[in-house]
Amino acid sequence: TPEVWVQVQMEATELSSFTVHCGFLGPGSISLVTVSWGGPDGAGGTKLAVLHPELGTRQWAPARQARWETQSSISLALEDSGASSPFANTTFCCKFASFPEGSWESCGSLPPSSDPGLSAPPTPVPILRAD
């Protein structure tokens, strides 16, 4: 069964900078990845970036840079302009779509006890979805 993992990382040098790493574990090729915050895509979440494996990326503030790391994983750099660092308590979700086979989405957040520069373990939190 395909799975999606999500890691949220606070940058050690800049506490207002966060990076979300997401990856797809499973067979098949990915046709689109969407990253949202505040909840799953379409369930109260706000779109941060959409990545196409061949045609490029689209992103919206506060996303700073979205990019592919491998054929099945992406990263999204975020710039937190607020002094209170709301990202620290925010859920980030990644949805990997493989059209028309299906799409898989998981969410993650920065662990409360995280030290700057340390990433959360890649623990998938699956959201059941079958297209």
Epitope: L32, A43, K47, V50, H52, L55, A97, P100, S103
Partner: nanobody
Framework: EVQLVESGGGLVQPGGSLRLSCAAS????????MGWFRQAPGKGLEGVAT???????KYADSVKGRFTISRDNAKNSLYLQMNSLRAEDTAVYYC??????????????WGQGTQVTVSS
């Protein structure tokens, strides 16, 4: 989450017509395009017709002049009127909502598909 449900497929003779419908429910999709895609047996996916939020419409060369895409925002519905159907139009047709990249609509959400078979 968004749910897209297609209907209107079936068996039709060459030269006949069908009208596919797609009903969207759930949240309002935040993408910027919707469209119809198809997959014939043993073949790859093909974008049939797409429409973006500005109303710009694109058709595959193979269906131009025969197929018409339209939408009803009030009913959250997408349609595909298919006329002068040919055997090569036989495929599973998917309604999809997605994002525009390089002028192409890339699906982010889609339905289960509806079978269209053109045969005498």
């Amino acid at each position: 989450e968004v749910q897209l449900v297609e209907s209107g497929g079936g068996l039709v003779q060459p030269g006949g017509s069908l009208r596919l419908s797609c009903a969207a429910s759930g949240f309002t999709f935040s993408g910027d395009c919707m469209g119809w895609f198809r997959q014939a047996p043993g073949k790859g996916l093909e974008g049939v017709a797409t429409i973006d939020n500005a109303g710009r419409i694109k058709y595959a060369d193979s269906v131009k002049g025969r197929f018409t895409i339209s939408r009803d925002n009030a009913k959250n519905s997408l349609y595909l009127q298919m006329n002068s159907l040919r055997a090569e139009d036989t495929a599973v047709y998917y309604c999809a909502a997605g994002w525009t990249f390089g002028g192409q609509c890339s699906p982010a959400d889609w339905g289960q598909g509806t079978q269209v078979t053109v045969s005498s």
